[in-house]
Structure formats: structure tokens, C-alpha cells
């Protein structure tokens, strides 16, 4: 369907690109000689960067460092320095900089004070940057500064003292809420959960926290959880781990309504050097890993059912290296239900797999046209792609970045990888999928890093080498012809490519630096791509296209989840902006209802290739280990359940008797003689 | 064939650092991680580490962490192993091992160079 | 890290009978097992992988077998060129280890 990717030669050249690009390159350089950069957007699509250096130099009692603090507000054509509004403070880069949720023009600078003063200090903004107010503060923050994503003048923050402090009104004055506090989170609604420790040390009394919730900021609490080991928020759900009575293993338990009423979740518990781990949650459901026993690196995905707590085994060994360590699992923002992640394979080598139905079937990723199978493969006719993420990076392997898609840009998935039987250790190729994943091509030799803009209408990469770089290449049709533009005469030492998150932009800033003998000169490039794009994009430049078709002829064709969708995409030849205010067209049909439409429910399991689920013979005529809201529950069931975020309607519907499976709670996790509420007074 | 030729002998005095040199050829030197073992004499096998050649990224065992250093040179097809602060008893041959093409967790060694014999002594 | 146990750490065999090692792990190390061979002054070679699948070269006579913590490496019919010392080493997790050998001498 598509061909090998090919660098300039006939592959349709733009007339007069270079002049064009060179009209709308923006060349900055910053008058310091710090050792590190951090940037950052401020809000949607106000064009507001900031850019803040740092430069250290560790003395043999302090040390001593510089910021400088510098603002664009032309998407990085042109940067001014605003060091002086923040009175030239030396700002602590670890804490970063901490931007207020969505077009709140909000941003935190946290300063670096001396050794003896009472508390730290921050530098706060509401006008996008252009105002900084100095704020001492009553105690010294231990991590970022915290934004409620629902009021974004209410900010959180653990002490060194691990103290929870609240403010009301962004920073200006604040309040310590709470003592002994391991770990706090803003949950919906302004609420704030965190766990606490009763006798020792957060480190010491795990697995004997206490998680407690506020709904009003501080004023009163209630105890939702005792004897947890740690907490979590995905989608909906609230996690919790509680330690076991009997032994030094735990369990997870769900809540859907903020902590009132809990179930234990259909998990295996974990011993002490095992963990869970939420892979990625939405409003309907949730994936979790869970870590084998014993020093592994691999564990067993599981999805949950609606209600979060009947979990479906769905991925054997996959690779997850001890906790918090590397997993390559991507979710796929660019189609519905496809997420990527890899395998560890009896040999030890690791693989990579797709689902395109959210975790109900894992398979290979189809090898690219025109491949050859390297040498990882036994059968040189025979292999698949592997896709190289955050376990090759860890691996020092040389892949600049991991996988990429946007919401926005519909199918396309751009990541380095290699084909073969297993990821190999050799240099990678850049590959891309316009349809989510079900096919690839070589989109480019060599590693690169690359980006999208004009929501998938030019895609942007740059060599990744250890030598000065002056050249960037684009291409208009999602990566089968690129172009090569040199946009400085003077190589730069390449650091990194910034563009507006979400991929609406049209312009990306090259950042690097310049070095000569003793001085080392940090430059910003920003190319505007418009005049490349000339013209808006019209009717006749989209094309309908089924997302999930695999089998045209058959009338289920592109039914995932128990629907099908329907896009309007931009015609590969078409050269022409999708613009700012693009907006995903897509019409979803409904899809008649078949097993596949189904989960199992608790205490029924599907046999291997079988689509019905049959009762799990070791549960007959027992009474099971599950706890529905804390207390004995009558559980009825006719052994299936919709998948959640099925849409499905009519067809098959799995009736068959229903069963009244009698469930014994032995889950003590929140009995309610244990929940208490209290007063702030 | 694949052959991984290393420097000679070395005769050390502790506190001194030694630096050894393994030259790849018959495969393409950047496409597959160069391990370091060594074995003291009348010893078992001890890992030392590993460096990717291509992206020049290593991975030191703990024990050597500090004292360690891999680099190469791909325009020569060359590993370097040095080890610093030398004390008596890092007398030991020393290899550089070649791995698979697989990214592995963990890996074995198919081919192996024939080793250079490192003195520490006073 | 994974300690690797070999047993015995001599054994002494006549031209023709079968050698039998052994090589244990602290933990389960699945079969992510490798065995090597090595004689006087010269480097490790590679015999076994994957616990039981031989590598490129190796005479059929060597053959390993196990899974888990247990592993074997069985020489069917010594020759004279096979007294030598034996290692095993896992590859499952990091850092790589390998056992203290055991030396299979002539009787």
C-alpha cells in the first residue's frame, strides 16, 4: 500500500521550500553559558514558552548556581529575558516548572534559599509569565507544587517535614492540613487523598498507613483505609494495596465513589518484593500489572471489568523490570483500543505486541513490506517488528525516542524498531503506521527524533548523531517523501525538538548549543512551516477511511469494542493545512453483539480458543474469596459481562440461567467500625 | 569468522590504573554489545560489564562501579576496558566477550577474546 | 544476585564413560542457563545455551538438560580433548553469574 520511503530524488518536490523555510527561520541565541535547559509550554495555543538555564558549580561546602529565565510568546521565534522578574534567583530544577492546568496562565518557580531560613521560597505568575510575585513560604516544599485540575488556584505540597500543606487562593498564603503524610494526590471534585503513618516513618509503616480523604480542603477528614501498603487514582477508580492479616502479602481493592465503599479486586496478591503496577486507566476500565514472584522482569497484564474489580488475564510475561523500572507499554493515542508493550520470551530476548481490541487479543506487529529479517531471526523469510521504548532506552541502546502518536493525527505511529524474531541491539530504523499499528513501512534509516505538527499534515525529524547537525528534513505525506532543509550554515550540537503539545503547531524549534574552546553558547531554531502548507485544507483533500478494516467483504468489518468508526482523513498527496482548529471527523456505527462482545464474569473462565465461558471448576460448590463493598454479598451472575466501553446492541446475547453464587467477604480492609471521621479543629 | 583480538600483558603497581584494548572484526562491530569478564588466577568467571558500541551506553556490575570505565572507538572497531585504583587483588586475565543480537535482560557469551593477563604487584 | 553452585568440583572420568555435572541456582533461573568449556591458557567456549540447545559447532556428545534451579551437563562419551574445566553461568537476570566450575580430569 505503500512504498519505501525515499529522500528527496522525484518524490514529489515542493517547489520553492528552501526559500519559503528560510523566510520563517528564527534564529535565537541565549547570552549565557549554562550547563542545562528546561522548557516549557504555557497554556493552549498562546504561542507563551518558558525557558529557564540553569548553571552550577559544586564548591567544596555550597554550591553556587545561576538561572536565567526567558520568555517567547511567538512559539520560540524570539525569546526576551525576564531574569529580573524572578530578581535574578537561583531556581531549584528539579522542581521545575510548575504550569497550571489547561489555559490558567498559572506557573510556579521554586527558588533555591540558604541553608538556615525557615522555609522555601516560590515565584508565582497568573498572566502567562509576564508578572512574577515572590512568595516566602512557611516550611520547604519536598516535591512540585500541586494544581487541583478542577480550581486551579487550589495548590497542594508535601514538606521535608512531610507535612500536607493546602492553599486557596494560588500560593499566596498557605495551611498545614496534616502531619505524617507519605503520599497526597487530588483526586475529582477537589479532593484530596493521602496516606499516613501512625508510628514511624512513611518507609517504616508500610503496609500499616492509614488513607485518608478530605473533601473540603482540610476542614474535616475521614479515614477511608487502614493497613495500606500504597494508594493510586486511574480513570474512575481508586486504588488502594492493603496488607493480608496472615501473612506479609497484599491485596488491591477498588473504590468507584472515592473511598465509601470498597471490593477486593479478582487479583493474585503480591508478596514483599513483588508489586502492582495501573499501566494505563480510562473512564471504563482499567490495565494493571501484575509482577511474577522472584527477580524476573516480567509480570502478567490483567484488564478489569467496568466496576474495576472481575479482571481478565490478558498478557503472559510481560516485560516490566522490578518496581518502578521500565516497561515499554504505549498506549496508541491515535486509534481506539490499540496499545503496544513487549514480551519476554523464554530465551530471555524480548518481543513486541499489539492489541487492537484493548487487551482482549495480543499479536506480533506485522513485519514492514519490503523488510528483510535480521540476524535475530531464525527463518530470514519470516518475522515481525519490535518497536523500541522505554526498556531499549534504559539499555543505552541508540534510540532517542520512544514510540509517538497524537490524538489528533489519526493511524500514525512513528517509532524506531528492528525486524527480526526479538528487539535487537543493532542500530534501529525509524518505522510508521498511517492505520494504527496493523501496517508499517521504513519510514527512515537511522535513528532520529521526530514530531508531529498540523495534527499529522507534516511530520518533522532530525538525525540523531553525536556529531553538530545543520540539517532537518519534513515530509508533507505522512513519511513516504522527505525533504532536506539546512537551516543553519553553523552545525549546533543537537539537544533536543520542541513543539507545541498536541501537535496542532506549525512550527518546531531546534535546540542545541555551539561550543569553542571554553564557552559553551545554547541556540534555539524555530521554523514556521506555514508558507509549506499554503492553503487551508478543503473537502476534496480529506478521504473517508474505516479505522480497524482488516476484511472489507465481511459485514463486522471494523467493529472493535462494539463499534466502528469512520474518519475523515487527509489525502496523502493533499498539501495543505489542517490548521489550529482542526477537528477529528469521525462517524461511529454500531456493531451487532457476538461473544467477543463479552468478558467473563466472576468465577467463569474462557478455555483456550473457546469463545463461551464455562464456571471455573475450582470454584464449584465453594465459597469464594471476594468482597463486594465490604461486606457478604449474593452475588448473581450469568457468567458474562459487556467488555467495558462496549457499545454493542442486539445480535448475540449470552442468556443462560442465572447463577447465585453465594461469595464470602473475608476482606477486613475497611470494616465499618474502623471508619471515623474527624474534625480539623 | 568473528575474532576478538586483545592487547598484551600488563605488569601493574596498585593504585595504578590499566587499560585494555579489544579489536573486533568479521561482524559489524556496532550491532553488538562487548562484555568484560575476568578470571583470577585459579579462579571462576566474574562480569564486569558491558558497552553498547553503537550508542557508546554501558552497565557496570556493582563491584566495579566507580573504578570502571568502557569506551571504543568505532572508526577501529575497538573496546577498552580500564580499571583505576588497581589493587593486588585485580590480578586476573581479563576478556572481552561478545554477546548476541538480541537485546537480552541478561546474556551469554558466544565468542570470547583470548584474554590479557593483568599483574598488580608492588 | 543469583549465586550459581557446581557440583562436584572435581570429577575424574576414564576415555569413553559418561561425565555427568551439575550446576544449581539460588533461584529460578527458567532455562536461561549457558555452559562453557575451558582448558588451560585459553578462553571460555561457549557449549550449551538455553539450558539444552547447543551451539554452533559442539559435538553431539554434549547434551544439557533442566529448568528452573536444576541443570545438567552430560558428556555421553569422554575423548580426550573434553577433559577440561566446566562452567554454567545464567543469563536471567543481572548480573550475569557463573558457578565456581568443576573439573573433569582423567582417572
Known amino acids: 500500500r505503500r512504498g519505501a520511503p525515499a529522500e528527496d530524488q522525484d518524490c514529489g518536490r515542493l517547489p520553492d521550500f528552501i526559500a519559503k523555510l528560510t523566510n520563517n527561520t528564527h534564529q535565537h541565541v541565549f547570552d549565557d553559558l549554562s550547563g542545562s535547559v528546561s522548557l516549557s509550554w504555557v497554556g493552549d495555543s498562546t504561542g507563551v514558552i518558558l525557558v529557564l538555564t540553569t548553571f552550577q558549580v559544586p564548591l567544596v561546602i555550597v554550591s553556587f548556581g545561576q538561572s536565567k529565565l526567558y520568555r517567547s510568546e511567538d512559539y520560540g521565534k524570539n525569546f526576551k529575558d525576564i531574569t529580573n522578574l524572578i530578581n535574578n534567583t537561583f531556581i531549584r530544577t528539579e522542581f521545575g516548572m510548575a504550569i497550571g492546568p489547561e489555559n490558567s496562565g498559572k506557573v510556579i518557580l521554586t527558588a533555591e534559599v540558604s541553608g538556615g531560613s525557615r522555609g522555601g521560597r516560590v515565584f508565582r505568575s497568573s498572566d502567562f509569565a509576564k508578572n512574577f510575585v515572590q512568595t516566602d513560604l512557611p516550611f520547604h516544599p519536598l516535591t512540585q507544587m500541586m494544581y487541583s485540575p478542577q480550581n486551579s488556584d487550589y495548590l497542594l505540597a508535601l514538606s521535608t517535614e512531610n507535612g500536607l500543606w493546602v492553599s486557596k487562593n494560588f500560593g499566596e498564603k498557605w495551611e498545614e492540613i496534616h502531619k505524617a503524610v507519605c503520599l497526597a494526590k487530588w483526586g475529582p471534585n477537589n479532593i484530596i487523598f493521602f496516606t499516613t503513618h501512625v508510628n514511624g516513618s512513611c518507609k517504616a509503616d508500610l503496609g500499616a498507613l492509614e488513607l485518608w480523604r478530605t473533601s473540603d480542603l482540610g476542614k474535616t477528614f475521614k479515614t477511608i483505609g487502614v493497613k495500606i501498603y500504597s494508594f493510586g487514582l486511574g480513570g474512575r477508580f481508586l486504588f488502594a494495596s492493603v496488607m493480608a492479616d496472615k501473612d506479609t502479602t497484599r491485596r488491591i481493592h477498588v473504590s468507584t465513589d472515592q473511598g465509601d465503599t470498597w471490593s477486593m479486586a479478582q487479583l493474585p496478591s503480591v508478596g514483599q518484593e513483588q508489586f502492582y503496577s495501573i499501566l494505563a486507566a480510562n473512564e471504563d476500565m482499567v490495565f494493571m500489572h501484575v509482577d511474577e514472584p522472584g527477580d524476573t522482569g516480567f509480570g502478567t497484564i490483567f484488564t478489569s471489568d467496568d466496576r474495576g474489580i472481575v479482571y481478565s488475564k490478558s498478557l503472559d510475561r510481560h516485560l516490566y523490570t522490578t518496581t518502578g523500572g521500565e516497561t515499554d507499554f504505549t498506549n496508541v493515542t491515535s486509534l481506539r483500543g490499540v496499545y503496544i508493550t513487549s514480551t519476554l520470551s523464554e530465551d530471555n530476548s524480548i518481543q513486541s505486541m499489539i492489541t487492537f481490541d484493548q487487551g482482549g487479543r495480543w499479536e506480533h506487529l506485522r513485519k514492514p513490506e519490503n523488510s528483510k529479517c535480521d540476524a535475530t531471526a531464525k527463518n530470514k523469510n519470516e518475522c515481525s517488528l519490535h518497536i523500541h521504548a522505554s526498556y531499549s532506552i534504559s539499555q543505552k541502546l541508540n534510540v532517542p525516542m520512544a514510540p509517538l502518536s497524537e490524538p489528533n493525527a489519526v493511524g500514525i505511529v512513528i517509532a524506531h524498531g528492528s525486524v527480526g524474531d526479538a528487539i535487537s541491539v543493532m542500530v534501529p530504523d525509524v518505522y510508521i503506521s498511517d492505520d494504527g499499528g496493523y501496517s508499517w513501512a521504513k519510514m527512515l534509516e537511522g535513528p532520529h527524533y521526530y514530531t508531529i505538527l498540523d495534527s499529522g499534515g507534516i511530520i518533522v525529524a532530525i538525525e540523531h548523531s553525536n556529531r553538530p547537525i545543520n540539517v532537518i528534513k519534513f515530509s508533507t505525506d505522512e513519511g513516504q517523501c522527505w525533504q532536506s532543509y539546512v537551516f543553519t550554515q553553523e552545525p549546533i550540537y543537537f539537544t533536543g525538538l520542541a513543539s507545541e503539545p498536541g501537535a496542532r503547531s506549525m512550527n518546531i524549534s531546534i535546540w542545541g548549543f555551539t561550543e569553542s574552546f571554553i564557552t559553551r553558547q545554547w541556540v534555539s531554531y524555530t521554523v514556521d512551516f506555514k508558507d509549506i502548507l499554503e492553503r487551508n485544507c478543503e473537502e476534496d483533500d480529506y478521504t473517508t477511511w474505516l479505522a480497524h478494516s482488516t476484511d472489507p467483504g465481511d459485514y463486522k468489518d471494523g467493529c472493535i469494542l462494539g463499534y466502528k468508526e469512520q474518519f475523515l482523513r487527509l489525502r496523502k498527496s493533499s498539501v495543505c493545512q489542517n490548521g489550529r482548529d482542526y477537528v477529528v471527523a469521525k462517524q461511529p456505527s454500531v456493531c451487532p453483539c457476538s461473544l467477543e462482545d463479552f468478558l467473563c464474569d466472576f468465577g467463569y473462565f474462557r478455555p483456550e480458543n473457546a469463545s463461551e465461558c464455562v464456571e471455573q471448576p475450582e470454584l464449584k460448590g465453594h465459597e469464594l474469596e471476594f468482597c463486594l463493598y465490604g461486606k457478604e454479598e449474593h452475588l448473581t451472575t450469568n457468567g458474562y459481562r459487556k467488555i467495558p466501553g462496549d457499545k454493542c446492541q442486539g445480535g448475540m446475547n449470552p442468556a443462560r440461567e442465572v447463577k447465585d453464587l453465594k461469595k464470602k467477604c473475608t476482606s477486613n480492609f475497611l470494616n465499618p467500625t474502623k471508619q471515623n471521621s474527624k474534625s480539623n479543629s | 569468522q568473528v575474532q576478538l583480538v586483545q592487547s598484551g600483558a600488563e605488569v601493574k603497581k596498585p593504585g595504578a590504573s590499566v587499560k585494555v584494548s579489544c579489536k573486533a572484526s568479521?561482524?559489524?562491530?556496532?550491532?553488538?554489545?562487548m562484555h568484560w569478564v575476568r578470571q583470577a588466577p585459579g579462579q571462576g568467571l566474574e562480569w564486569m560489564g558491558w558497552?553498547?558500541?553503537?550508542?557508546?551506553?554501558?552497565n557496570y556490575a556493582q563491584k566495579f562501579q566507580g573504578r570502571v570505565t568502557m569506551t571504543r572507538d568505532t572508526s577501529i572497531s575497538t573496546a577498552y576496558m580500564e580499571l583505576s585504583r588497581l589493587r593486588s587483588d585485580d590480578t586476573a586475565v581479563y576478556y572481552c566477550?561478545?554477546?548476541?543480537?538480541?537485546?537480552?535482560?541478561?546474556?551469554?557469551?558466544?565468542?570470547w577474546g583470548q584474554g590479557t593477563l593483568v599483574t598488580v604487584s608492588s | 544476585e543469583i549465586v550459581m553452585t557446581q557440583s562436584p568440583a572435581t570429577l575424574s572420568v576414564s576415555p569413553g564413560e559418561r561425565a555427568t555435572l551439575s550446576c544449581r541456582a539460588s533461584?529460578?533461573?527458567?532455562?536461561?542457563l549457558a555452559w562453557y568449556q575451558q582448558k588451560p591458557g585459553q578462553a571460555p567456549r561457549l557449549l550449551i545455551y538455553g539450558a539444552s540447545t547447543r551451539a554452533t559447532g559442539i559435538p553431539a556428545r554434549f547434551s544439557g538438560s533442566g529448568s528452573g534451579t536444576e541443570f545438567t551437563l552430560t558428556i555421553s562419551s569422554l575423548q580426550s580433548e573434553d577433559f577440561a574445566v566446566y562452567y554454567c553461568q545464567q543469563f536471567r537476570v543481572l548480573p550475569p553469574t557463573f558457578g565456581g566450575g568443576t573439573k573433569v580430569e582423567i582417572k
Open positions: 568479521g561482524y559489524t562491530f556496532t550491532g553488538y554489545y
Open positions: 566477550a561478545r554477546g548476541g543480537p538480541q537485546l537480552r535482560v541478561a546474556e551469554y557469551f558466544q565468542h
Open positions: 558497552i553498547n558500541p553503537n550508542s557508546g551506553g554501558t
Open positions: 533461584q529460578s533461573v527458567s532455562s536461561n
